[in-house]
């Protein structure tokens, strides 16, 4: 759970209770067991800017 009163994470990131901050969902490729990765599965990635 994200701490009460904190701003939601931006697209492409998810709240980490372990690290007490928003973390990049992209890092779940290398570290899929990170606590925040469960929150990434439901959230769409940040859009590519080509």
């Amino acid at each position: 759970e994200q701490a009460p009163g904190t701003a939601p994470c931006s697209r492409g990131s998810s709240w980490s209770a372990d690290l007490d901050k928003c973390m990049d969902c992209a890092s779940c490729r290398a570290r899929p067991h990170s606590d925040f990765c469960a929150g990434c599965a439901a959230a769409p990635p940040a859009p590519f800017r080509l």
Partner: antibody, heavy 119, light 111 residues
């Protein structure tokens, strides 16, 4: 404020040894992969070693150029990472940086320490 | 190993103009969702400073003048408008695999 404070370095003869240290503060050290990156005019920025987490028994990875000669280690109780360098060669000369990454990018770097391998 | 080729090696730009730096990977470093390319700025006597992650996402505190784009094998760092403080060497780095490698750097100078 995140800080990576390095120590060690200096002049060493070919075949000699040197140990570098890096003490971290301002972030949850035990969750981060710790790395050493060196820089020289010849090789540019060159990643040389990484140590991961206790939960995986501290796996390590090395660049081919240093494999078998360099050893990376960490002490989470001291928020510290080390690089033991043996059988040093002139081509190991450069600026050595410790750097942390959660998984992908090196978001914080030490100030750098210079190693010169010369007779 | 994935090789990153940066171009140009050096670049001279007038104040207020656009600087464009290219980074080409020897293989794709993108999934369908993310690109595993990151950008750094280094000034003389200092360590590299992290600027942009996953091809296009600025680190906190990095001015909007810096932007990154690209996917697959071709990536670009744009700086516009260029300011005096931007004189530095810029490096790309991939995190697709071990070893993570860096480009050779692009030196940006002001005219």
């Amino acid at each position: 404020e995140v800080k990576l404070q390095q120590s060690g370095g200096g002049l060493v003869q070919p075949g000699g040894s040197m140990k570098l240290s890096c003490v971290a503060s301002g972030f949850t050290f035990s969750y981060y992969w710790m790395n050493w990156v060196r820089q020289s005019p010849e090789q540019g920025l060159e990643w040389i070693a990484e140590i991961r987490l206790q939960s995986n028994d501290y796996p390590t990875h090395y660049a081919e150029s240093v494999k078998g000669r360099f050893t990376i280690s960490r002490d989470d109780s001291k928020n510290s990472v080390y690089l033991q360098m043996n059988n040093l060669r002139p081509e190991d000369t450069g600026i050595y940086y410790c750097a942390c990454r959660y998984a992908d990018y090196f978001d914080h770097w030490g100030q750098g320490t210079t190693l010169t391998v010369s007779s | 190993d994935t090789v990153l080729t940066q171009s140009p090696a050096s670049l001279v730009v007038s104040l207020g103009q656009r600087a464009t730096i290219s980074c080409r990977a020897s293989q794709s470093v993108s999934t369908s969702d993310y690109s595993y390319i990151h950008w750094y700025q280094q000034k003389p006597g200092q360590p590299p400073k992290f600027l942009i992650k996953y091809a296009s996402n600025r680190d906190s505190g990095v001015p909007a003048r810096f932007s990154g784009s690209g996917s697959g094998t071709d990536f670009t760092l744009n700086i516009h408008p260029v300011e005096e403080d931007d004189t530095a060497i810029y490096y790309c780095q991939h995190s697709w695999e071990i070893p993570p490698t860096f480009g050779a750097g692009t030196k940006l100078e002001l005219q």
